[in-house]
């Protein structure tokens, strides 16, 4: 069971300081942006981190949404990352959900975060380069200190 606590507005960056945004095709991508670019591209660069408490002691659970014309929420259905047109619900009556990720500090790097899928244990949100695009993907954690699964989350209060 996941019960919603509240939400905050955030800018998410990879460790190369590229900013996560949702493009016109609803794809989550990373791109180099100045602070001015970041503001100019809002709301596509502003993510709503919806915080949930897990009924099992597994930590801070989050759903990540973006509001452009409508609200879309990040999903990892079938281990494929996509944004689905939906509002994060108040309650999720299950122990797993394709839209719920566990947000934790990276040990030894307190300002860095990682997001583990609640549906696929051991799989994390990651940044991966594919041709000329830096994409948000779901990746099985296979090594310690993998920078591709680490992110910074900046409050936009």
């Amino acid at each position: 069971y996941f019960g919603k606590l509240e939400s905050k507005l955030s800018i998410i960056r990879n460790l190369n300081d590229q900013v996560l945004f949702i493009d016109q095709g609803n794809r989550p991508l990373f791109e180099d942006m100045t602070d001015s670019d970041c503001r100019d591209n809002a709301p596509r660069t502003i993510f709503i981190i919806n915080m949930y408490k897990d009924s099992q002691p597994r930590g801070m659970a989050v759903a990540i949404s973006v509001k452009c014309e409508k609200i879309s929420t990040l999903s990892c259905e079938n281990r494929i990352i996509s944004f689905k047109e939906m509002n994060p619900p108040d309650n999720i009556k299950d122990t797993k959900s394709d839209i719920i990720f566990f947000q934790r500090s990276v040990p030894g790097h307190d300002n860095k975060m990682q997001f583990e899928s609640s549906s696929y244990e051991g799989y994390f949100l990651a940044c991966e380069k594919e041709r000329d695009l830096y994409k948000l993907i779901l990746k099985k954690k296979d090594e310690l200190g993998d920078r591709s699964i680490m992110f910074t989350v900046q409050n936009e209060d």
Epitope: G3, M60, N91, N155
Partner: antibody, heavy 120, light 111 residues
């Protein structure tokens, strides 16, 4: 202006029951988890119980698990704490609170507290 | 769940700096950046000083700062003033079956 106003405190005998209420105004109550926090005379703060936005998720400190029940009515902007099988060690000022979680956007709101005294 | 561990008391003279520690575990302080600090004067409700480890709400003096290393969070107060004399509590989100946990509290005396 944000306000949280607690009511329902008072004197109760050990083993008795009491229900606290907290009426919220000045913010969108239904968008936030809420908590009860208590402070025994001369002691520190103790988080007691919390509830999710929709009321489906309820969370308790080990010291009150099974005796206290938290609930909310979003249509009335009201938070409740039903306290059963009260003990002397439950004597405290009970604060209704929306503690910090995601920071300044949502704020950090506390009532002024209501005193619950458990004594024969 | 156990309370987070703080020193029972600290003291300092006006103008000095003091630091209050708050030690937890990887299930609370160490695992999340959701650590906050409160100031409480006698008979008053707690007042938020720091949220998410190091962020100050508007209206809070920049003399108050927060940090975290591993399972220990710290509150530093610089340029101590008489009105800083109060009780200070840390708090953290916890992955246990509860939701939050508070620290044991620290009484600050300004000499």
């Amino acid at each position: 202006e944000v306000q949280l106003v607690e009511s329902g405190g008072g004197l109760v005998q050990p083993g008795g029951s009491m229900r606290l209420s907290c009426t919220a105004s000045g913010f969108t109550f239904s968008e936030y988890a809420m908590s009860w926090v208590r402070q025994a005379p001369g002691k520190g703060l103790e988080w007691v119980s919390g509830i999710s936005t929709g009321g489906g998720g309820t969370y308790y400190a080990d010291s009150v698990e099974g005796r206290f029940t938290i609930s909310r009515d979003n249509s009335k902007n009201t938070l409740y704490l039903q306290m059963n099988s009260l003990r002397a060690e439950d004597t405290a000022v009970y604060y209704c609170a929306k503690p910090w979680l995601s920071g300044s956007r949502s704020g950090d709101f506390w009532g002024q507290g209501t005193l619950v005294t458990v004594s024969s | 769940q156990s309370a987070l561990t703080q020193p029972a008391s600290v003291s300092g003279s006006p103008g000095q700096s003091i630091t209050i520690s708050c030690t937890g575990t990887s299930s609370d302080v160490g695992g999340y950046n959701y650590v906050s600090w409160y100031q409480q004067h006698p008979g008053k409700a707690p007042k938020l000083l720091i949220y998410e480890v190091s962020h100050r709400p508007s209206g809070v003096s920049d003399r108050f700062s927060g940090s975290k290393s591993g399972n220990t969070a710290s509150l530093t107060i610089s340029g101590l003033q008489a009105e800083d004399e109060a009780d200070y509590y840390c708090s953290s989100f916890t992955s246990s079956s509860s939701l939050y946990v508070f620290g044991t509290g620290t009484k600050l005396t300004v000499l």
